[in-house]
């Protein structure tokens, strides 16, 4: 799909399975032609979107995209549930789809289950 | 343009194992959630589940939990589907698609892998 | 599970003539984005599945605008205003809303 709009590539219904305790970065990909736009992280709360103020963000830039960082310092299980990135550019607000955190919180879990036992089984990680 | 390759037809013996696999070509595969359906003779489209190869995280449909297992090789832009423990019930065409993650902008199916199972 | 019900189970056209198929399903397929991801696949004689149409209403590149997706919610029609030779085989709704996805048991269009 190319063109001059503002893009953002967060896949429609994403999920990253993580661990509190443990640090994470959460990345929009934003794809934009002359000026970067001004980029927000929110949390899904229902179906309003909480912006995320006062939060570690970056940007990081490569080839053909740039991405902006929500850093997590560390996870906390209150981090589990879903997130949205959104572009302002041309005073229109673009949002991406949302993306889920499954936090699993070590301190209750009796070992740390392996990557493809998470992957495969979403819903044993709701915190 | 997308395209999907499919491995070839499979004879396997009842509790034996069996992994399929599929190749695109026109897009990497990091951009896209790739599936797998399986087909039995004359019978509906079932979804076994599907591969985001960006993470390896997959979903299934629980029916299909234990039995199947996705894997994606994004150096060869790959996915596999393994079937353990086959039964005459795992006899069937297994198509593999590929959509587009962000836009929905493409879904395209691949020629399918028909398995028999047969001592 | 989303259940998907089609019908007819088979529709006999004479070429020329209009074709409807209706796809209910047994859940709102209304996303919490605002999409309803219903899609069309037309599976022909020996060969795989091929989506026709995405999001209800959007023809994928190259199907004939002789196709048109319509619905929203629960029900959903497929229709084809004039039927030609090429599109028989059996068409199937299927859901991309929620896990697993499913599909609906398919509508076999043979030609009178």
């Known amino acids: 799909k190319e063109s001059c709009d503002v893009q953002l590539y967060i896949k429609r219904q994403s999920y990253h399975s993580i661990f509190a305790g443990d640090p994470f970065k959460l990345e929009c990909p934003v794809k934009y032609c002359a000026h970067r736009p001004q980029v927000t992280w929110c949390k899904l709360n229902g179906t309003t979107c909480v912006k995320l103020e006062g939060r570690h963000t970056s940007w990081k830039q490569e080839k053909n995209l740039s991405f902006f960082i929500l850093h997590f310092e560390p996870v906390l299980p209150s981090d589990n549930g879903s997130y949205r990135c959104s572009a302002n550019f041309l005073s229109a607000i673009i949002e991406s789809h949302s993306t889920t955190l499954y936090v699993t919180d070590v301190k209750s879990a009796s070992e740390r289950p392996s990557k493809d036992e998470m992957a495969s089984r979403p819903w044993l990680l709701y915190s | 343009e997308v395209q999907l390759q499919q491995s070839g037809a499979e004879l396997v013996k009842p509790g034996a194992s069996v992994k399929l696999s599929c190749t695109a070509s026109?897009?990497?595969?990091?951009?896209?959630?790739m599936y797998w359906v399986k087909q039995r003779p004359e019978q509906g489209l079932e979804w076994i589940g599907r591969?985001?190869?960006?993470?390896?995280?997959?979903r299934y449909d629980p029916k299909f939990q234990g039995k199947a297992t996705i894997t994606a090789d994004t150096s060869s832009n790959t996915a596999h589907l393994q079937l353990s423990s086959l039964t005459s019930e795992d006899a069937a065409v297994y198509y593999c698609?590929?959509?587009?993650?962000?836009?929905?902008?493409?879904?395209?199916w691949g020629a399918g892998t028909t398995v028999t199972v047969s001592s | 599970d989303v259940v998907m019900t089609q019908a007819p189970l088979t529709l006999s056209v004479t070429i020329g003539q209009p074709a409807s198929i209706s796809c209910k399903s047994s859940?709102?397929?209304?996303?919490?984005?605002?999409?309803?991801?219903l899609n069309w696949l037309l599976q022909r004689p020996g060969q795989s599945p091929k989506r026709l149409i995405y999001?209800?209403?959007k023809l994928d590149s190259g199907v004939p605008d002789r196709f048109t997706g319509s619905g929203s919610g629960t029900d959903f029609t497929l229709k084809i205003n004039r039927v030609e030779a090429e599109d028989l085989g059996v068409y199937y709704c299927?859901?991309?809303?929620?896990?697993?996805?499913?599909f609906g048991g398919g509508t076999k269009l043979e030609i009178k």
């Open positions: 026109g897009v990497n595969i990091k951009d896209t959630y």
């Open positions: 999001l209800v209403s």
């Open positions: 299927w859901q991309g809303t929620l896990f697993p996805r499913t």
């Open positions: 698609a590929v959509y587009d993650g962000y836009y929905e902008s493409f879904d395209v």
């Open positions: 859940q709102s397929l209304l996303d919490s984005d605002g999409k309803t991801y």
């Open positions: 591969i985001d190869p960006a993470n390896g995280y997959t």
